[in-house]
Structure formats: C-alpha cells, structure tokens
C-alpha cells in the first residue's frame, strides 16, 4: 500500500459529453480518492467558461444552489452524505449551452481540484432522398436530391454510384436555431441508360451509430428507342409462320405501336398485333422494308427492317410455307 499522502485526489470526468437539443444531459464528475488518502469535501461547484460566477453549487451545510433552478440538478449530492459525486443534470438543452464547463471539488486538506468538460449540443437530423425526374437535356442537371434537415453540427452527405455524376451541396439554417439543413444534388447528363438505375445518398452525423444510406431510383423521361428483332436474314419460301417484335425502350411507357412499310400499308401476309408483327407463309419471294413506329408522351420514333423471303433448296425446312 502506498503510504498516506503519496497519492493525490483526482477529479474524473469525460473530456467531452454529447447532449441533444431539447433533451436533458448529465455532466458526469467524480472525485477519485486513492487508497490510504484522506479527504473531506465541503463544496461542489460548476462554472461555465467565459461567465462570471458559478452556475451550480452544492455546499456541505447550505445544500444546492443554482443559477437556473429549473434547468439544473445535482444528480447524487445529498446533505449529510459524502460529497464524491458532483454529476450535474441539465434539462432542456439549448444551442447556447454548448461550451466548456468546470467541475470543482473543495477538499480538505488538499484544496480545490477541478476538471474541464466540453458539452457538445447535438441535433439529430431527419434525412430524405428523392428522385428529380428529368428529360434528355444534353447537359448536366440534378437527377437526385438528398436533404438532411435540422442537424447540429451539419450532416455530411456523399453520393455513391458507378454512373459518375457530381455532387452539389449547400447549407441553410434549420428551423431550430443553431441547426443546419444540408441539401445535396446529384448532377449528371441524363441518358436513357441511366433511367431506372440506383444511386445511394450516404448521410453521416455524430448522432448516428452508423451512416444512413438512402437509395434513389433515377428517372429519365425520353422518347422511344426502337429496334425490330426476330429476323435472322435467313428466311426462305416454305418456312413456317414467323414473328417480328418491335422492341421499344421509353419513359413513360409506349402508348402505341404502328406497323407499316416504306410503300405504305402492310401487305396481306403481315398482320400487326401490337408490338408484334406476324409474318404468314408466302409462296413467292418478298423484299419489303417494314417500319415500326412507336409513340409515347414525349414523341414518336421508328425503326426500319428490310425482310427478304428467298427461294431455297427444297431439302431445307426453314422456309415459310403452307403446311
């Protein structure tokens, strides 16, 4: 055991304590007395840096006194009990409560012992992410928006995507004094390839255990992109019925499909069935250019396909013929 008087009494407290705006917080503060050391505490004091006087005092015979009695309370100190725990509870935290506080013990025979604690006033932000629906513009525009509302300190917003894009982040004061609303726009040149893809907004804040991830499904409005499939350049007389498909990608969805030829209406062997064109068996060679015209809310686009039905050797069974 160390001989009496070799150790010193020490005030123990965290260097920083976080608290939430409007909530209560406890500033912990304890007197650590080494074994064999004798100390008697006669007073506990809390003071704020930069302010004259003390905000809370617990006196061994007078009890507690507070600068703001409704907002402060000694958690454990009691008259007639040993004063070793100076922890102070603060109610209804305000932005202006953030700062440095001193917890002080008046001891005998050691004298005063104190420690400083930084009180950090936080506000947990509310986060939302939404798509910014765009059309093809040919230049960069905001395609997604992520908003972190009422944070203290301001939240950090980053974007994660394999599409590229650039963030544009701004801050404005929040609804509650001392809070900040952060808005981040994700900017890219819109293209049909981007439509339906996801980007992720990552919001980081001291009050979060882990970052919040918000996924945005991108929307690009564009006119139809059209192609015709189903023809393999290998159609012969005697072949069974065949089907061509008008493949259209668009946003919004296509509202109509119209089949025609460069010569005008469809010939009798071609029957339109919405996005599909049924080619019936023919008994003589054909060389026709088919047109599929697709319409959506943004306009109409078309694709052309020249189809040939050729005479082939009778041994082959791939031709178009009547059964």
């Amino acid at each position: 055991w160390p001989p009496p008087g070799t150790g010193d009494v020490v005030v123990q407290a965290p260097t920083q304590v976080p608290g939430f705006l409007g909530d209560s917080v406890t500033l912990p503060c304890y007197l650590q007395v080494p074994n064999m050391e004798v100390t008697h505490v006669s007073q506990l004091t809390w003071a704020r840096h930069g302010e004259s006087g003390s905000m809370a005092v617990f006196h061994q015979t007078q009890g507690p006194s507070y600068s703001e009695s409704k907002r402060l309370e000694f958690v454990a100190a009691r008259l007639g009990a040993e004063l070793r725990n100076a922890s102070l509870r603060m109610f209804g935290l305000r932005v202006e409560d953030e700062g440095n506080y001193t917890c002080l013990f008046v001891t005998f025979p050691q004298g005063s012992r104190s420690v400083d604690i930084w009180l950090r006033v936080l506000a947990k932000p509310q986060n939302t992410a939404e798509v910014q629906k765009v059309q093809l513009t040919g230049e960069p525009v905001p395609m997604a928006r992520c908003v972190s509302t009422g944070g203290r300190p301001p939240a950090q917003i980053t974007w994660h995507s394999d599409l590229g894009g650039m963030p544009n982040t701004s801050q404005v004061p929040g609804f509650l004094s001392g809070t900040v609303t952060v808005t981040s726009l994700w900017i890219l040149v819109p293209s049909s390839q981007v439509d339906g893809k996801n980007v992720t907004c990552k919001v980081e804040h001291e009050s979060f255990e882990k970052p919040q991830l918000l996924t945005v499904n991108l929307t690009v409005y564009y006119p139809p992109e059209v192609s015709i499939s189903g023809y393999d350049n290998n159609w012969y007389l005697g072949q069974n019925e065949a089907t061509l498909t008008c493949d259209a990608r668009s946003n919004p969805e296509p509202t109509g499909y119209n089949w025609s030829t460069t010569m005008g209406p469809l010939p009798p062997f071609a029957v339109a069935q919405g996005a599909q064109l049924l080619i019936r068996p023919v008994d003589k060679p054909i060389n026709t250019t088919l047109i599929c015209n697709v319409t959506n809310a943004l306009g109409a686009r078309q694709a052309e396909l020249t189809v040939q039905v050729k005479e082939g050797p009778p041994s082959e069974h791939s031709g178009i013929s009547r059964n």
Epitope: H40, G53, S54, T61, P109, G111
Partner: antibody
Framework: EVQLQQSGAELVRPGASVKLSCKAL????????MHWVRQTPVHGLEWIGA????????AYNQKFKGKATLTADKSSSTAYMELSILTSEDSAVYYC????????WGQGTTLTVS | DIVMTQSPKFMSTSVGDRVSVTCKAS??????VVWYQQKSGQSPKALIY???YRYSGVPDRFTGSGSGTDFTLTISNVQSEDLAEYFC?????????FGAGTKLELK
C-alpha cells in the same frame, strides 16, 4: 443553534505555552473541519490551520508550523490549539471557526504575551 | 500564498446608499471566495460563500459577484446595522488567506 464556546482570555509569559479550547454545540462536530484564525491590528486575519475531527487530518499554514498544534476530542466535541514558545508577536485574538462551512465563529480568545 | 487585495480600506456612506467593496486575488481562485462582516467588538460572521451565494438568514441587500481573480460585495440600501468591517477570504487553496478589510463608516 450553533455555538462555538472558546476558553477565556490568557495572559502568559514569553517562552511559555498555552492551550486554547473550542467547544462545538448545535451540529455534528465530526462533520467538518475546524479552522483556527488569529486577528491583530497589524496583520489582520491570518489562517493558522485546521483539523478535521472525524479523521484527525490537519493542515497548517507554513508560518505557524512548529508554533501551533491542533487536536480534537470527539467525545467532548472540543477542538484544541496549543501555542508554544510564545512571543509578544503572538498576542492576538484567536478564533475557532468552520469558516465558509458555517456562518459562525467562536467569540474569540484574547491572548496577551507579556 | 494567494494574496487577497481588498479596496478601499475605508468607505463613508449614508443610510440608503449603495456601496461596493472589491477584492482581487493574486491568482485564479475560481469562485471560492467568502465574505465576512465583523461588527466592532464581535467576531466575524459569514455573509456570502462561493462568491455569490448568500447564507440562509442573510438579507438580500447583500450581493456577491465575480470569479477568477476579481470579486465584489455590494450592499444596496445600506442600513445602520451594516456599519462594520468587511473581509474577503479565498478557500481555493491552502494556506487560506484573507483580505485586509474594508471599514464601512457613517458620513
């Protein structure tokens, strides 16, 4: 009501010793330290030292180490201060008091060294 | 040792006046300052602890303020029973030290 009853005035010869007493009434004697303070026209109020009757722990002003010895008797709730090798410089009114812990001081003991 | 420099030494006042006594510590003593009143022929009596808190029973015309090194005792609406000597004392570190006193006299 808290009362601190100090022993009567003393007239002593230089070189002698004297033991002053202070009886505490109206509060738990072992709860907090008893301080001793002296007052003279020249030096005003001077802190001599203190004892915590509960633990026996003492603290002294370096100026009075070897001059003053503080003790306490828990059974009678009495604090004592013995002053040794007295000189005329030690002539003063001596007070016992819990200082900032309570409002009260003893009535004082006048010590004359002559 | 911490030196407590008190001023003024003497102060003349009239009943109903407001007076202030100051005390300056030679180093930071936080708010660990007590103010005493000593009437002629009596022992001192504590008025204010921790720089600004009145002991129970002390009239509210006595107000203490300050922290660190500069402290003030203010008596508003001075009464005849307030004519006395006032002392400050620091209890932040040992040895405890007192101011030299301020004597409040009637004009």
């Amino acid at each position: 009501e808290v009362q601190l009853q100090q022993s009567g005035a003393e007239l002593v010869r230089p070189g002698a010793s004297v033991k002053l007493s202070c009886k505490a009434l109206g509060y738990t004697f072992t709860d907090h330290e008893m301080h001793w303070v002296r007052q003279t026209p020249v030096h005003g109020l001077e802190w001599i030292g203190a004892i915590h009757p509960g633990s026996g722990v003492t603290a002294y002003n370096q100026k009075f180490k070897g001059k003053a010895t503080l003790t306490a008797d828990k059974s009678s709730s009495t604090a004592y201060m013995e002053l040794s090798i007295l000189t005329s410089e030690d002539s003063a009114v001596y007070y016992c008091t819990p200082l900032w812990l309570r409002r009260d001081w003893g009535q004082g003991t006048t010590l004359t060294v002559s | 040792d911490i030196v407590m420099t008190q001023s003024p030494k003497f102060m003349s006042t009239s009943v109903g006046d407001r007076v202030s006594v100051t005390c300056k510590a030679s180093q930071n003593v936080a708010t660990n300052v007590v103010w005493y009143q000593q009437k002629s022929g009596q022992s001192p009596k504590a008025l204010i602890y921790s720089a600004s808190y009145r002991y129970s029973g002390v009239p509210d015309r006595f107000t203490g303020s300050g922290s660190g090194t500069d402290f003030t005792l203010t008596i508003s609406n001075v009464q005849s029973e307030d004519l006395a000597e006032y002392f400050c004392q620091q209890y932040n570190s040992y040895p405890l030290t007192f101011g030299a006193g301020t004597k409040l006299e009637l004009k």
